[in-house]
Amino acid sequence: AILGRSETQECLFFNANWERDRTNQTGVEPCYGDKDKRRHCFATWKNISGSIEIVKQGCWLDDINCYDRTDCIEKKDSPEVYFCCCEGNMCNEKFSYFPEMEVTQPTSNPVTPKPP
């Protein structure tokens, strides 16, 4: 491991469509990938009228959008499906939404997912 960088070896796994996709619903996912590349964790969720619905969580392959992010934070303004990624084992257990707005002050909506 390179000093100062969290190496990701496993992530929290969740799949809302586990029956259709023929996977487990929840668990811990070991992260595989080319040895020369970085690995990350991700979380995706929807905000349905203020209610958080997790779509998927798991491992994510080498992506500069995720480099050196210890927390899983979505910064896009009002996406249809929220997505965040991070580095470090199980870093996708918690995820947040901090939209980067140009003029107004950013609002914080931290989310601690509860298993269904």
Epitope: K37, T44, D62, D63, I64, E80
Partner: antibody, heavy 115, light 111 residues
Framework: QVQLVQSGAEVKKPGSSVKVSCKAS????????INWVRQAPGQGLEWMGT????????SYAQKFQGRVTITADTSTSTAYMELSSLRSEDTAVYYC????????WGQGTLVTVSS | QSALTQPRSVSGSPGQSVTISCTGT?????????VNWYQQHPGKAPKLMIY???KRPRGVPDRFSGSKSGNTASLTISGLQAEDEADYYC???????????FGGGTKLTVL
């Protein structure tokens, strides 16, 4: 091993649409982006757009905005690129590639637009 | 994003070294370590040779190396071999908040 297998060659009339598929295997489809790139005969590579298969979020090159639609079906590990209002200049080989680094590529799909 | 600028062609004899340049702007090549290099033989799909300016994927010979200075990235091929004759493209990372762009390509001829 990682493989991206694309659909076969297509011949299309000007003004019509084409939909090219890219089936991924050998890795978890929901763990990276799929990018689409095209190459006209004797020309260079041209980036068309990308999709995050997990969120469905897409980004398109300005040149193709409004004419290209990239989708992904996680249940079959397949990405699709649909290009509409075809013209002769769209005759090209269309490639899908895995991840932001384009580390694995499909074999390419030749789309010929001719009246 | 405008295309990255590459020389149309370069050439070298077997055993020699050649360098292919890829010039962008301070907002793309100059700002980030996200330039990649691809090799394409006629009628084949491109192959990733260098990513993140200087990282080499598994299976790529160490004769291929990448570097960057200012707004220009470079691919150096040392100990040139006949099979290195191909088109080479530079390109950027694409995904999330990053949009992709490629150079126009450089034809490498091994004399």
């Amino acid at each position: 091993q990682v493989q991206l297998v694309q659909s076969g060659a297509e011949v299309k009339k000007p003004g019509s649409s084409v939909k090219v598929s890219c089936k991924a295997s050998g890795y978890k489809f929901t763990s990276s982006y799929i990018n689409w790139v095209r190459q006209a005969p004797g020309q260079g590579l041209e980036w068309m757009g990308t999709i995050n298969p997990v969120s469905g979020s897409t980004s398109y090159a300005q040149k193709f905005q409004g004419r290209v639609t990239i989708t992904a079906d996680t249940s079959t590990s397949t990405a699709y690129m649909e290009l509409s209002s075809l013209r002769s200049e769209d005759t090209a080989v269309y490639y899908c590639a895995r991840g932001g680094w384009f580390d694995y590529w499909g074999q390419g799909t030749l789309v010929t637009v001719s009246s | 994003q405008s295309a990255l600028t590459q020389p149309r062609s370069v050439s070298g004899s077997p055993g020699q070294s050649v360098t292919i340049s890829c010039t962008g702007t301070s907002s793309d090549v100059g700002s980030y370590n996200y330039v990649n290099w691809y090799q394409q033989h006629p009628g084949k799909a491109p192959k990733l040779m260098i990513y993140g300016v200087s990282k080499r994927p598994r299976g790529v010979p160490d004769r291929f190396s990448g570097s960057k200075s200012g707004n220009t990235a470079s691919l150096t091929i040392s100990g040139l071999q006949a099979e290195d004759e191909a088109d080479y493209y530079c390109g950027t990372f694409a995904g999330g908040s990053y949009y992709g762009v490629f150079g126009g390509g450089t034809k490498l001829t091994v004399l």
